[in-house]
């Protein structure tokens, strides 16, 4: 059970002053320099004012230095995401210093007490960084603080208190409770480092949001809208856990931010791209797949530094597991006529055929409604790289899949029993790849046959490169 330390106000100098008892009080924050990928290697403990461990453990003053900061804990032992992250950093940056900030004594508390302790821990990290800065060749610009959950706000405090500016802070699903809407000096914020990038994976607009919903960095990335992560649904989790609980779902979605970051370290050749967008709904409509004016970026470790005047909210879809990368496509379908549509929205599916592979049958999510005599935009994504697209099959699903649609159909039938066949006409589909920024136009195979109705399909072949528009820059060109 957690040790009953009080909140920050009563901690005062417990960190460094010995109590007047026979046992000396140890500092509540330790810095463990991980010298090996092997989790069983004990590493070295660094402490302010003691230079010997730096020499003994070959601390590289000119290399990058990562500080990994855990969050609230119920167990008092480091969870395995930390081991994975340490390993991935060692794999990717072989000469780097990887320091685990152990604040378990202050994190293994009631959540409210742990929150109150974040400031003290931030101060300890800042003191360590100030001391390291006194050494020749150590540069704060080479420091990258990586904080998960409550640890993200600890990183914010550290960046705020240090003399100078740290190079980068990555917030991995920063904690929401007690931080949502807080003043910028009481949470992670863009002024805490030269570059602050954030991954949000467990935000909820209803109920308790474990992760913070508001943007808190220079770039704030919301994979899968920042809420429901693939592979973390009750079905997925309970399917693999004999006695699973909702806690497993929470852990899966909250921790997904860490695994996305790990993925960016170890699968450098499969970078995931996020696209700037004002909100999740617009992204779901496929409106936001542009890379112009820094509107797209790699996620995780490979993110390119962007210091916007305003927070930049970015979105992407991902797979359910590593590698998380998917391929995003914007599909623009111009519906030029519309017959007897009734009340219900059609259910469309597309299959994309490419030079490398063909996609599965992909649903077109209708975010609002199909507009006639207008261009309707959709987002589709595939797990595999299809190569250059060659043709598209558009299918209008026949039988209704939902009770709601069945009811609407029945109501439509009652009001218009002899409702003639529903139909709409589509001449072309314009497609833009998010990953390559390439634009293509697909035309119906038979120019005379442009109509589609329930249970029918329509085939489109590539008929033009581009949309007769100026080319946009490709994110793949900008890979580091």
């Amino acid at each position: 059970s957690p040790v009953p330390f009080g909140p920050e106000g009563r901690l005062e100098d417990k960190l460094h002053k010995p109590k007047a008892t026979q046992t000396e009080v140890k500092p509540s924050v330790r810095f463990n320099l991980r010298t090996s990928k092997d989790p069983e290697h004990e590493g070295c403990y660094l402490s302010v004012g003691h230079s010997q461990p730096l020499e003994d453990c070959s601390f590289n003053m000119t290399a990058k230095t990562f500080f990994i900061i855990h969050g609230w804990t119920m167990s008092g032992i480091f969870e395995n995401w930390l081991h994975k992250l340490v390993s991935a950093l060692h794999t990717r940056e072989k000469d780097a210093n990887v320091v685990v900030v152990d604040w378990l004594p202050l994190a293994h508390q009631l959540y409210t007490d742990a929150v109150n302790n974040t400031r003290v821990v931030g101060h300890s990290i800042a003191r360590m960084l100030d001391w390291l800065q006194e050494k020749d060749d150590f540069s704060l610009g080479n420091v990258h603080l990586i904080g998960y959950s409550l640890g993200a706000h600890v990183a914010g405090y550290a960046g705020n208190f240090v003399k100078g500016t740290v190079g980068r802070i990555t917030g991995l699903d920063p904690a929401g409770p007690m931080f949502e809407g807080a003043d910028i000096h009481k949470r992670l914020s863009p002024d805490d480092a030269d570059f602050v990038d954030v991954l949000h994976t467990y935000t909820r607009s209803f109920g308790l949001s474990i992760g913070i919903q508001m943007p808190v960095g220079h770039i704030d990335i919301y994979p899968n809208g920042g809420d429901f992560q693939p592979g973390c649904g009750l079905n997925d989790v309970l399917g693999s856990i004999a006695y699973g609980t909702i806690t497993e779902v929470v852990k899966c979605e909250h921790e997904r931010a860490v695994h996305l970051f790990v993925d960016s370290l170890v699968n450098q050749d499969k970078p995931s791209f996020a696209f700037q967008c004002t909100d999740s709904n617009r992204f779901k409509k496929g409106i936001c797949l542009s890379c112009r004016k820094n509107r797209c970026n790699s996620i995780g470790y490979n993110a390119k530094k962007m210091r916007n005047k305003r927070n930049s909210k970015m979105y992407l879809k991902t797979r359910a597991g590593m590698p998380f990368r998917v391929y995003h496509y914007q599909m623009k379908i111009h519906v030029f006529s519309y017959k007897n549509m009734g009340e219900i929205e059609p259910t469309f599916y597309v299959t994309l055929y490419g030079t490398n592979a063909d996609s599965q049958t992909l649903p077109l999510e209708i975010v609002e409604r199909i507009e006639q005599n207008a261009t309707n935009t959709f987002l589709v994504y595939t797990e595999e790289d299809l190569g250059d697209l060659l043709k598209i099959q558009l299918t209008w699903e026949g039988a209704s899949q939902s009770w709601y649609n069945l009811w609407k159909e029945f109501r439509s039938y009652l009001s218009q029993p002899r409702n003639p066949g529903r139909e709409l006409n589509i001449r072309r589909i314009r497609v833009k790849s998010g990953e390559t920024q390439r634009k293509l136009t697909f035309c119906t195979e038979d120019p005379e046959n442009t109509s589609i109705s329930p249970g029918r399909e329509l085939w489109f072949r590539k008929c033009r490169d581009g949309w007769r528009m100026k080319n946009e820059t490709s994110p793949t060109v900008e890979l580091p």
């Epitope: 059970s1 957690p2 040790v3 140890k26 509540s28 330790r30 463990n32 989790p39 069983e40 004990e42 403990y45 167990s75 008092g76 032992i77 480091f78 969870e79 395995n80 930390l82 081991h83 685990v100 152990d102 378990l104 004594p105 293994h108 693999s240 856990i241 004999a242």
Partner: antibody, heavy 120, light 107 residues
Framework: QVQLVQSGAEVKKPGASVKVSCKAS????????IHWVRQAPGQGLEWMGH????????NNNEKFKDRVTMTRDTSISTAYMELSRLRSDDTAVYYC?????????????WGQGTTVTVSS | DIQMTQSPSSLSASVGDRVTITCRAS??????LNWYQQKPGKAPKLLIY???KLHSGVPSRFSGSGSGTDFTLTISSLQPEDFATYYC?????????FGQGTKLEIK
């Protein structure tokens, strides 16, 4: 070399409590966690819980939640496990084991075991 | 809790034989699988951790493999001192759980 030395065998009556000690040497006591694992006669191994000696934080298996208390004395590098309200099915060999800082770390060194017999 | 199931429960083999013991987890344990050897009246000893890493001082005839939910411990050429009970243990999720054990007996 790393060593964990446990206290001697105990015979207890049902309803009583037993406190087993585990003295560590050969490494920095506060750098690893100490776990308690028991083994009933002819049975397998069952994890009971752990203590982080650095600050005394504990986490127990739900099965023993309200009956087990883990403490430590860093001045003598010793961990303790107290099991209360003993029943006959608590008759087992109780082991302390050292574990690294992660969930994934194995139990790399074990005490020799303490036999606890619960009998009326 | 994650259930760990070992098979077989017991097996008889001769010195020099190659022996394989399997361990199945009730869910993916991310390769956080450790193997221990226990002799009668003694404490368990760590053999292999993180699926395939050999603990210091353990002979190279012991090896581990597997991923996801299925893991194996292999002894390439049995020696007289290898007759014991072997346990697998998952380090993925609390509470830590062990397999029921596999007793390796001399034929």
């Amino acid at each position: 070399q790393v060593q964990l030395v446990q206290s001697g065998a105990e015979v207890k009556k049902p309803g009583a409590s037993v406190k087993v000690s585990c003295k560590a040497s050969g490494y920095t006591f506060t750098d690893n966690t100490i776990h308690w694992v028991r083994q009933a006669p002819g049975q397998g191994l069952e994890w009971m819980g752990h203590i982080n000696p650095y600050y005394g934080g504990t986490n127990n298996n739900e099965k023993f939640k309200d009956r087990v208390t883990m403490t430590r004395d860093t001045s003598i590098s010793t961990a303790y496990m107290e099991l209360s309200r003993l029943r006959s099915d608590d008759t087992a060999v109780y082991y302390c084991a050292r574990k690294g800082i992660y969930y994934s770390s194995p139990f790399d060194y074990w005490g020799q075991g303490t036999t606890v017999t619960v009998s009326s | 809790d994650i259930q760990m199931t070992q098979s077989p429960s017991s097996l008889s083999a001769s010195v020099g034989d190659r022996v394989t013991i399997t361990c199945r987890a009730s869910q993916d344990i991310n390769n956080y699988l450790n193997w221990y050897q226990q002799k009668p009246g003694k404490a368990p000893k760590l053999l292999i951790y993180y699926t395939s890493k050999l603990h210091s001082g353990v002979p190279s005839r012991f090896s581990g493999s597997g991923s996801g939910t299925d893991f194996t411990l292999t002894i390439s050429s049995l020696q007289p001192e290898d007759f014991a009970t072997y346990y697998c243990q998952q380090g993925n999720t609390l509470p830590f759980t062990f397999g029921q054990g596999t007793k390796l007996e001399i034929k």
